[in-house]
Each structure stands twice: as structure tokens, then as C-alpha cells.
């Protein structure tokens, strides 16, 4: 006999990375039936939701106003079918952003590379933080983390087409609360020509739409919003 | 044109600090790193570090460290570079060169340390 | 750091000769490698980057090539200006390093 639901999916609107003081809403998708749904914060119990009716919906919201670094942290949720409890999800990693000042971002050897060469990020920050974070712009999120006094090397390797896109840093002041982003730096990777076609760079998010970072526009299933979002995230663990 | 224009060459003491200037021109300033190379009597060429003019973000050779700080004047497309506790094994021509790449260089100042 | 080693060390060569020159680097450096050149007295001159990009107003008798951490540079016909050392240059990775330089002299 099954002792509990599988568990759902959580994820974070329009972002997973929130600037301080916008708004935000954590979605957790369960089952339909659902009576009950309990968003959970840093372990202990944040909310309740009971949708109505249970039968029709399966995906409750929870938002946050104003983002701010008390919000930030881990979040999950369970839901409830009659007596019978899910699992609970996978962790969100919610974070603030626009604490403080802005980071530098440099590339070497220079934005214009020749496929093969040896690419590495230089993100600076002088305030007092010791993690840094380079962020691709498109929907893999890609996330490279990075330490150093006031500054840190996020060395690519030999890059290839794949490596195209535009790139910002963060400094960390802890996992869940991070600097402004630096000023994009856009990669353009030139040479490789038998592989152009085959590796377009990732879909990239207009340019306006930095004003709140990275916000998708993409409509697909819920679900992979979670798993991109969860993506991004491991390695804020 | 591209040109970098290095200051004049210097002789100092040892335990003496240089400060060798380079002046860019012919190109956006702020879009490219400068690096600073050495170069011994009769020897080969040393990469001493690079400096990039947009975020001063600098990248020193661990071997000069503690020695060598690189700073940037934009207003005059300007790059320092000041090697302290100079010793005689100092005594090179020092050059800087742009881009990643080491695209264009100085002409090279000649840096003397005697006592 | 990456070690880059230079050979021969020095070389003498007719004009109208084919000269190579090789580098072999301690690890990997992609494709991340110049070829200079420089005469007595004056600055390093950029011949070859990337590996095997020529410098505009090089002439096309320079031709470089290699990946991982072999590399070649090729003088297909020496010409009396040529005459001068050459250094390979890694800049895949921080220190970036020379070779310890090619004298290549008159026969």
C-alpha cells in the first residue's frame, strides 16, 4: 500500500533570482484532488493553500510582495490528498539580487575568440565577499561559481560555438543573497565552421528583460520551468 | 593606428621602486587588457601580469606578486606599472602589450638597477 | 605553470630555405598560442595567433599550426629579413609563458 504521493514540483516566477523589493510567486504543482498544500521555509512551516475546487486544480501560488534577503532561502512544498501526504520537492534556492554594488566582468583573452582558444571571466567585486557567480544568459541557465578576495577566475577551456551568448557575473555575500549583475559581456566565438550549424548558442532572452534577470520567455510545460530553474540551482549547493 | 608610447628609461637604486608608464592611442582603450612583459639582457620574455582598463581587474604573475601593482588612468589612456624592492636581477627592458593576445607593443623602457 | 619548450634553440639557414621551429607546451593549451618575432634592439612583432591566424601584413610564407601541445611555426622561403629569434607565446592560461626563443641566423 502506498504510504505517500509523489512528490511535486516546485519552481519560482518569473525567476528564481528575485531583485529586492519586486515580487515573486513559488509554484507548487501536486495532483488534482489536492486538498492541501504547505510551502515549506528554511524547515519549517511558511504557508497553506487549499485549493478550490481540489478536483480542478493542481498548482498553487504562493507570493511574495517584496522580495528581501529575510525571503531569501530554501523552500519546498508537500501537498495532501484525503489523509495521505506527498513527498516533499525538490529544494528552491530563492535569491535576492541587487544587494549592495555592482561587479566587473572582463573576458580574456578578449570577447572576439577563435574557436579552440582557452576562454576565462574575470569577475571583480571589492566589497566584502569571497563567491562569485558567472551567469550565461539563455534558458539552460548555466551557473559557475567562483571564489577569491575581490576577484575570481572562471576559466571556460577551449571554447566552440556552444560557448556563443552573453554573460554576466554576481558577487555572493552569502547562497541566497547576491550583488547586482555586472554589465553583460557578450562572447561571440568565431572559426569552427563545420560545427556553426550544429551548435546553435542557447536561446537568449531579450535584452530588456535583464531589468529583472534572466525572465523566461519561454511558455513550455510547468514542469520544465522546475527543472531548469532546479538546474541552475545545484550549484548553489 | 594602435600605438603604445613607453616612458623614458629609468636607473635606480636597489630596494628602490619604478613606475613605467604606457600611453595608448589609435583604438578604444577601455575594450582591450594591457599585459607587461620583461626582458633581460641577452635573456628570453617573462610575462610579469596584465590589467584590464574597463574594470581594473588585474591578473599578476604569482612571481612579482608582492612586488608589481598595475593602475590605469582612462582619462589619459593611460597604463602603470610600479615593480618595488628593485633588484639587480631587475634590470630588463619592460614592455606593454595589448589584448589577450599580445596583439601591439610599446617601443619598451629600459630599467636599470645598480647600485 | 605551463612549461613551454622551444626548440632548436638556435638555427642557421640559407635564403630560399624551409625552416620550422616547434614548441611543445607541458599541458593543453587549446589553440591559445602566438608566434613573435623579434630583431636586436627592437620590440616583439606578432606573426601568427591563435595557432595558425596569420597577422595582417605578415607575409603568407609564416604559417603556424598544431593543438594540444605540439606546435609548429613554418618559414616556407627565408628571405634576409627574416633572419631574427622567434618565441612562442601561451596564453591559455595564467602565467602566460614564452619559449625560451629560436635564434635563427645566416648560413
Known amino acids: 500500500q502506498q504510504q505517500t504521493l509523489p512528490k511535486p514540483f516546485i519552481w519560482a516566477e518569473p525567476h528564481f533570482m528575485v531583485p529586492k523589493e519586486k515580487q515573486v510567486t513559488i509554484c507548487c504543482q501536486g495532483n488534482y484532488g489536492a486538498v492541501e498544500y504547505q510551502l515549506h521555509f528554511e524547515g519549517s512551516l511558511f504557508a497553506v493553500d487549499r485549493p478550490k475546487p481540489p478536483e480542478r486544480i493542481n498548482k498553487v501560488q504562493f507570493y511574495i510582495p517584496d522580495m528581501n534577503s529575510r525571503m531569501a532561502g530554501q523552500y519546498s512544498c508537500i501537498y495532501r490528498v484525503g489523509e495521505l501526504w506527498s513527498e516533499p520537492s525538490n529544494l528552491l534556492d530563492l535569491v535576492v539580487t541587487e544587494m549592495y554594488d555592482t561587479p566587473t566582468l572582463s573576458v580574456h583573452p578578449g570577447p572576439e575568440v577563435i574557436s579552440g582558444e582557452k576562454v576565462t571571466f574575470y569577475c571583480r567585486l571589492d566589497t566584502a565577499t569571497s563567491m562569485f557567480l558567472l551567469l550565461k544568459e539563455g534558458r539552460s541557465s548555466h551557473v559557475q561559481r567562483g571564489y577569491g578576495k575581490v576577484q575570481a577566475e572562471f576559466p571556460l577551456g577551449p571554447v566552440t560555438t556552444a560557448h556563443r551568448g552573453t554573460y554576466r557575473c554576481f558577487g555572493s555575500y552569502n547562497n541566497h543573497a547576491w550583488s547586482f549583475p555586472s554589465e553583460p559581456v557578450k562572447l561571440l566565438v568565431t572559426g569552427d565552421i563545420e560545427n556553426t550549424s550544429l551548435a546553435p548558442e542557447d536561446p537568449t532572452f531579450p535584452a530588456d528583460t535583464w531589468g529583472t534577470y534572466l525572465l523566461t520567455t519561454e511558455t513550455g510545460l510547468q514542469k520544465d520551468h522546475a527543472l531548469w530553474d532546479h538546474t541552475a540551482q545545484n550549484l548553489l549547493r | 593606428q594602435v600605438q603604445l608610447v613607453q616612458s623614458g628609461a629609468e636607473v635606480k637604486k636597489p630596494g628602490a621602486s619604478v613606475k613605467v608608464s604606457c600611453k595608448a592611442s589609435g583604438y578604444t582603450f577601455t575594450s582591450y587588457w594591457m599585459n607587461w612583459v620583461r626582458q633581460a639582457p641577452g635573456q628570453g620574455l617573462e610575462w610579469i601580469g596584465m590589467?584590464?582598463?574597463?574594470?581594473?581587474?588585474?591578473n599578476y604573475n604569482e612571481k612579482f606578486k608582492s612586488r608589481v601593482t598595475m593602475t590605469v588612468d582612462t582619462s589619459t589612456s593611460t597604463v602603470y606599472m610600479e615593480l618595488s624592492s628593485l633588484r639587480s636581477e631587475d634590470t630588463a627592458v619592460y614592455y606593454c602589450?595589448?589584448?589577450?593576445?599580445?596583439?601591439?607593443w610599446g617601443q619598451g623602457t629600459t630599467v636599470t638597477v645598480s647600485s | 605553470d605551463i612549461q613551454m619548450t622551444q626548440s632548436p634553440s638556435s638555427l642557421s639557414a640559407s635564403v630560399g630555405d624551409r625552416v620550422t621551429i616547434t614548441c611543445r607546451a607541458s599541458q593543453d593549451i587549446g589553440s591559445s598560442l602566438n608566434w613573435l618575432q623579434q630583431k636586436p634592439g627592437k620590440a616583439p612583432k606578432r606573426l601568427i595567433y591563435a595557432t595558425s591566424s596569420l597577422d595582417a601584413g605578415v607575409p603568407k610564407r609564416f604559417s603556424g599550426s598544431g593543438s594540444g601541445t605540439d606546435y609548429t611555426l613554418t618559414i616556407s622561403s627565408l628571405q634576409p629579413e627574416d633572419f631574427a629569434t622567434y618565441y612562442c607565446?601561451?596564453?591559455?592560461?595564467?602565467?602566460?609563458?614564452f619559449g625560451g626563443g629560436t635564434k635563427l641566423e645566416i648560413k
Open positions: 607565446l601561451q596564453y591559455a592560461s595564467s602565467p602566460f609563458t
Open positions: 590589467i584590464h582598463p574597463n574594470s581594473d581587474i588585474t
Open positions: 602589450a595589448r589584448h589577450g593576445r599580445f596583439d601591439y
